[in-house]
Amino acid sequence: IPTEIPTSALVKETLALLSTHRTLLIANETLRIPVPVHKNHQLCTEEIFQGIGTLESQTVQGGTVERLFKNLSLIKKYIDGQKKKCAEERRRVNQFLDYLQEFLGVMNTEWIIES
Amino acid sequence: IPTEIPTSALVKETLALLSTHRTLLIANETLRIPVPVHKNHQLCTEEIFQGIGTLESQTVQGGTVERLFKNLSLIKKYIDGQKKKCAEERRRVNQFLDYLQEFLGVMNTEWIIES
């Protein structure tokens, strides 16, 4: 991704900028943005970034708040790149089954599953 | 989802069935299926289930292997339901920022980020 800093550092910096600019960002009291009901965040990246787009269009730009939205757009680029890597490599059934087993195992242990 | 057992139990059972039917599933030696390169599984659910569809269409059905694919289709239904919940609720900016902060926090600590 076109950034001098690694993605992990970019995420950390973005979290800090989010705290700094919170007051400015919540200034629009009538704005409503879709918020996922669950915490399986990776399933909702598209909606989260649509929400960020809505917020950006309603926020007075200038100073480091621009840096915040620039960072968020770089994070989106990174995630889009990861999504591309979901289907780039065509492998044999054996490898697919190993990955499927891993996926189900992760669902089993790490996903937030409602009964 | 239309199943008598909770999703968590469904996932466990599916993992067991996957082990049981491995030999049958890998019978097709020429079949190639996209396998994600990374371990951010939730980003790749669409591709994973497309792969499952490809595998199902190439597998001789009958007995408990049908149960395996039935379970996988119920898991897909559950995930599709979760994806619907990404944009069902329109909330104030404050709530959206809380969720965004949580999302970035999870990226920071739990995602598999390449440098």
Partner: antibody, heavy 119, light 107 residues
């Protein structure tokens, strides 16, 4: 930087077992599979199997199934390869190697551990 | 198991020579092949993956080509540090298998 550091040389008697360690550093241990490869003196390379530290799942070359056991200790970012019922033909240098991605090429190799089986 | 047949098993060449090593798979392995260099007493080092992708830090005189069953490693201008044994590895299917190696010696 990314490194795999293996345990020192071992001398074992036929019928015994050996456990070789491979300590990972410089990256998140659970993100990459660890493969094990061996090389008998003056011979080529042979794949033993891989372990996925993310879920402890391992897969073996049929030739070693039942004799090789791959494990990990996530708390110390260490992978282990145990080989039992040793025979003289198991004398070899054993390497651990990291998968770049899921079932990809080996991007980082350990320095190797010589295991000598001799009565 | 997929058999990997490498040729030649050894070759003598001079500094500056162009060297070609081939590897043939017993079945289609797509492009899931890497080339590995090993110097005496040292750990192996991967040079090329996915048949033709050079790994970061590997000199550009190394190149790979091929797909399906036939693959080639080329060293465009042999350097003193390139004298070593080269192996191909298929990581298309389990068990992963290596070629028997090609020893590149000084003429």
């Amino acid at each position: 930087q990314v490194q795999l550091v293996q345990s020192g040389a071992e001398v074992k008697k036929p019928g015994a077992s050996v456990k070789v360690s491979c300590k990972a550093s410089g990256y998140t241990f659970t993100n990459h599979h660890i493969n094990w490869v061996r090389q008998a003196p003056g011979q080529g390379l042979e794949w033993i199997g891989y372990i996925n530290p993310y879920n402890d799942y391992s897969r073996y070359n049929q030739k070693f199934k039942g004799r090789a056991t791959l494990t990990v200790d996530k708390s110390t970012s260490t992978a282990y390869m145990e080989l039992s019922s040793l025979r003289s033909e198991d004398t070899a240098v054993y390497y651990c190697a990291r998968d770049y991605g899921n079932f990809w090429y080996f991007d980082v190799w350990g320095q190797g551990t010589l295991v000598t089986v001799s009565s | 198991d997929i058999q990997m047949t490498q040729s030649p098993s050894s070759l003598s060449a001079s500094v500056g020579d162009r060297v070609t090593i081939t590897c043939k798979a017993s079945q289609d392995i797509n492009s899931y092949l890497s080339w590995i260099q090993q110097k005496p007493g040292k750990a192996p080092k991967t040079l090329i993956h996915r048949a033709d992708r050079l790994i970061d830090g590997v000199p550009s005189r190394f190149s790979g080509s091929g797909s399906g069953q036939d693959f080639t490693l080329t060293i465009s201008s042999l350097q003193p540090e390139d004298f070593a044994t080269y192996y191909c590895l298929q990581y298309d299917d389990f068990p992963y298998t290596f070629g028997q190696g090609t020893k590149v010696e000084i003429k």
